[in-house]
């Protein structure tokens, strides 16, 4: 197909958009999700993690929370670290809108951000050193 | 503060990061709280494909490879932002949408003692 061809049949009702850009409404759909914040799974996990909040006023959303695994190993039934198992981060991509200032003009850019969401305990892959 | 509607450059920064978690790691199989990945596809959304984790077990896998019900497998959930075509089918007009995805599972000590 020709360059710029889209899978979508463009309806007549589509708003006019300048070339090379897209119209984005940042009023969020589904603002109130069903998510429980009181579970404390980060401290109850066998691969516990901590949270760090990064804040950037030129990013939407301005707050992004990143998890960091507390240990290299996993916590066993006795509450001790077991280094025969590995705590590893689980990651998920999300989108953010970045505001860019170039002199007096402002432009907006979509950006994919990789967020570490939490950690899980895995059996290690043994690399035998030659 | 951000304006309600903005014109955004069509090129997405960091677009080409690996989006198939099955390819990027095998944690889903090696975890003590293993999960299956289910493909959720929606052409009216960007990204159109999102992988959803479903924990394989209610308990966790112990050192012997058996399910231990003294521990619980729970999904790790994350709210992410995606683009929803608005009006529908329009190629270059979107609205941000927040969706809740299960990214993987982790093994936790129970606080709810359902099972004796």
């Amino acid at each position: 197909g020709s360059e710029g061809e889209t899978f979508f049949q463009k309806p007549e009702s589509c708003p006019p958009v300048p070339g090379g850009s897209m119209k984005l409404d940042i009023g969020i759909i589904n603002e109130n999700q069903r998510v429980s914040m009181s579970r404390n799974i980060e401290s109850r996990s066998t691969s516990p993690w901590d949270y760090t909040v990064t804040w950037d006023p030129n990013r939407y959303p301005s707050e992004v929370v990143q998890a960091q695994c507390r240990n290299l190993g996993c916590i066993n039934a006795q509450g001790k670290e077991d280094i025969s198992m590995n705590s590893v981060p689980i990651q998920q991509e999300t989108l953010v809108v970045r505001r860019k200032h170039q002199g007096s003009s402002v432009s907006f850019q979509l950006e994919k951000v990789l967020v570490t969401v939490g950690c899980t305990c895995v059996t290690p892959v043994i690399h035998h050193v030659q | 503060n951000f304006p309600r509607t903005v014109m955004v450059n069509l090129n997405i920064h960091n677009r080409n990061t690996n989006t198939n978690p099955k390819r990027s790691s095998d944690y889903y199989d090696r975890s003590t709280s293993p999960w299956n990945l289910h493909r959720n596809e929606d052409p009216e959304r960007y990204p159109s494909v999102i992988w959803e984790a479903k924990c394989r077990h209610l308990g966790c896998i112990n050192a012997d490879g058996n399910v231990d019900y003294h521990m619980n497998s729970v999904p790790i959930q994350q709210e992410i932002l995606v683009l929803r075509r608005e009006p529908p089918h329009c190629p270059n007009s979107f609205r941000l949408e927040k969706i809740l995805v299960s990214v993987g599972c982790t093994c936790v000590t129970p606080i709810v003692h359902h099972v004796a």
Epitope: R34, R39 | N36, K54, C55, L58, N72, S73, P75, V112
Partner: nanobody, 123 residues
Framework: QVQLVESGGGLVQVGGSLRLSCEVS????????MGWFRQAPEKEREFVAA????????RYAHFVKGRFTISRDNAKNTVHLQMDSLKPEDTAVYYC????????????????WGLGTQVTVSS
């Protein structure tokens, strides 16, 4: 809006059997672990059985173990509870619900319940 419709209850003799069904709408049952719960008069609602997200794994409260079997039909968005060797103490209203955190789900986290289905076991 999530809707849970339980059915299959009734009056049964001690030692008899019933098969309860729960039709779920507004929520794909394949997305969550699912559970059955029950509430007897003057008692708190209690957990009866759970089935995992994938469906190959189930757990039971000690008082029904070996007598009840939970199953799911993802295609029909339905969860079942096969109840055998029923006892008078099984008399209760039975409810189903999703368990978004598996066995880690707390009763106080539920926003919605169905009307339930009455099971009465007579001696």
């Amino acid at each position: 809006q999530v809707q849970l419709v339980e059915s299959g209850g009734g009056l049964v003799q001690v030692g008899g059997s019933l098969r309860l069904s729960c039709e779920v709408s507004g929520l794909p049952v394949s997305s969550y672990a699912m559970g059955w719960f029950r509430q007897a008069p003057e008692k708190e609602r209690e957990f009866v059985a759970a089935i995992s997200w994938i469906g190959g794994d189930s757990r039971y409260a000690h008082f029904v173990k070996g007598r009840f079997t939970i199953s799911r039909d993802n295609a029909k968005n339905t969860v079942h509870l096969q109840m055998d060797s029923l006892k008078p103490e099984d008399t209760a209203v039975y409810y189903c619900n999703d368990m978004p955190y598996g066995l880690d789900t707390r009763m106080d986290e539920y926003e919605y319940w169905g009307l339930g289905t009455q099971v009465t076991v007579s001696s």
